[in-house]
């Protein structure tokens, strides 16, 4: 039941977005590509080795604003790009990982937990 | 109120191509994917493609490719198909059909493609 | 590609039945990131184009009269008319939209006794 003031107009459903998708496909993916309601991405992030893997895919609208927000996390090298303004818009995103710092030197590409 | 407009009827001779129409109103064109879907009577529905207008940005099942051309003109809110080559298997009732996802909220009222010489 | 399978192919009912029809799909149509099932129902009535009354396996369509009932998940969903009426006479078609093509199952028929 709508209460008094409530708007009836229905609201925007979101219109679907597909995204290239690499190393992060989901199951209902086709040709690697993905469907969502929110963002397409292309990050990369050192591995345990130190070597740097690109993956790419589809957020979902609910929490992906902050993960493209690209928050630096300590001891770990990685850097997130997002994407909106068409199909596959993630073929042209090309994040660089950061550079090093002095601590990353002595501490290598072990990941402190 | 959301009005996808199809003509009624399209009469083509065999190994012609013939484009098919689709007027959007009532809402913002690019906003919402636009569909195809095929239906031949005692046959159910096929899912043909689909159009991002925004970007025009296509699928298309792998059945079509090559049989069907999806297009759109934005500034008369139009959505094109164009099927090539056709043969009686190509006669059929096309609906245009418009989605946010992918289901089918909106649908046209249908264009009859006769293929006859 | 994703095959969807109906039954009964068609049913006569009296006026004030509960009326239940099948889609089966040949694999799993819940995508796991958001636990919806990407499954919707048509009606299309005889002369007519079809007309959505259920989207992500039993969300009712706005104005949609809510006898109609969607339910299931995974490969398992039902169509039920808690009372059928007279105009409910038409096909109803079940289509998935977890992967593409998108595709529809044969249809089941309803007729009025």
């Known amino acids: 039941k709508k209460e008094d003031g409530e708007s009836t107009a229905p609201t925007a459903r979101p219109k679907v977005l597909r995204c290239k998708c690499h190393h992060h496909c989901p199951e209902d993916s086709v040709n690697n590509i993905c469907s969502t309601d929110g963002y397409c991405f292309t990050m990369i992030e050192e591995d345990d080795s130190g070597t740097p893997v690109v993956t790419s895919g589809c957020l979902g609208l609910e929490g992906s604003d902050f993960q493209c927000r690209d928050t630096p996390i300590p001891h770990q090298r990685r850097s997130i790009e997002c994407c909106t303004e068409r199909n596959e818009c993630n073929k042209d995103l090309h994040p660089t990982l950061p550079p090093l710092k002095d601590r990353d030197f002595v501490d290598g590409p072990i990941h402190h937990k | 109120q959301v009005q996808l407009q199809q003509p009624g009827a399209e009469l083509v001779m065999p190994g012609a191509s013939v484009k098919l129409s689709c007027k959007a109103s009532?809402?913002?064109?690019?906003?919402?994917?636009m569909h195809w879907v095929k239906q031949r009577p005692g046959q159910g529905l096929e899912w043909i493609g689909d159009?991002?207008?925004?970007?025009?940005?296509?699928n298309y099942n792998h059945k079509f490719k090559g049989k069907a051309t999806l297009t759109v003109d934005k500034s008369s809110s139009t959505a094109y198909m164009q099927l090539s080559s056709l043969t009686s298997e190509d006669s059929a009732v096309y609906y245009c059909?418009?989605?946010?996802?992918?289901?089918?909220?909106?649908w046209g009222q249908g264009t009859t493609l006769t293929v006859s010489s | 590609d994703i095959v969807m399978t109906q039954s009964p192919s068609s049913l006569a009912m009296s006026v004030g039945q509960k009326v239940t029809m099948s889609c089966k799909s040949s694999?799993?149509?819940?995508?796991?990131?958001?636990?919806?099932?990407?499954l919707a129902w048509y009606q299309q009535k005889p002369g007519q184009s079809p007309k959505l009354l259920v989207y992500f396996a039993s969300t009712r369509e706005s104005g949609v009269p809510d006898r109609f009932i969607g339910s299931g998940s995974g490969t398992d969903f039902t169509l039920t008319i808690s009372s059928v009426q007279a105009e409910d006479l038409a096909d109803y078609f079940c289509q998935q939209y977890y992967r593409i093509p998108w595709t529809f199952g044969g249809g089941t028929k309803l007729e009025i006794k």
């Open positions: 059909a418009r989605s946010g996802w992918d289901y089918f909220d909106s």
């Open positions: 009532g809402y913002t064109l690019t906003n919402y994917w």
């Open positions: 159009i991002d207008p925004s970007d025009t940005y296509t």
């Open positions: 694999q799993s149509l819940l995508k796991s990131s958001n636990q919806k099932n990407y």
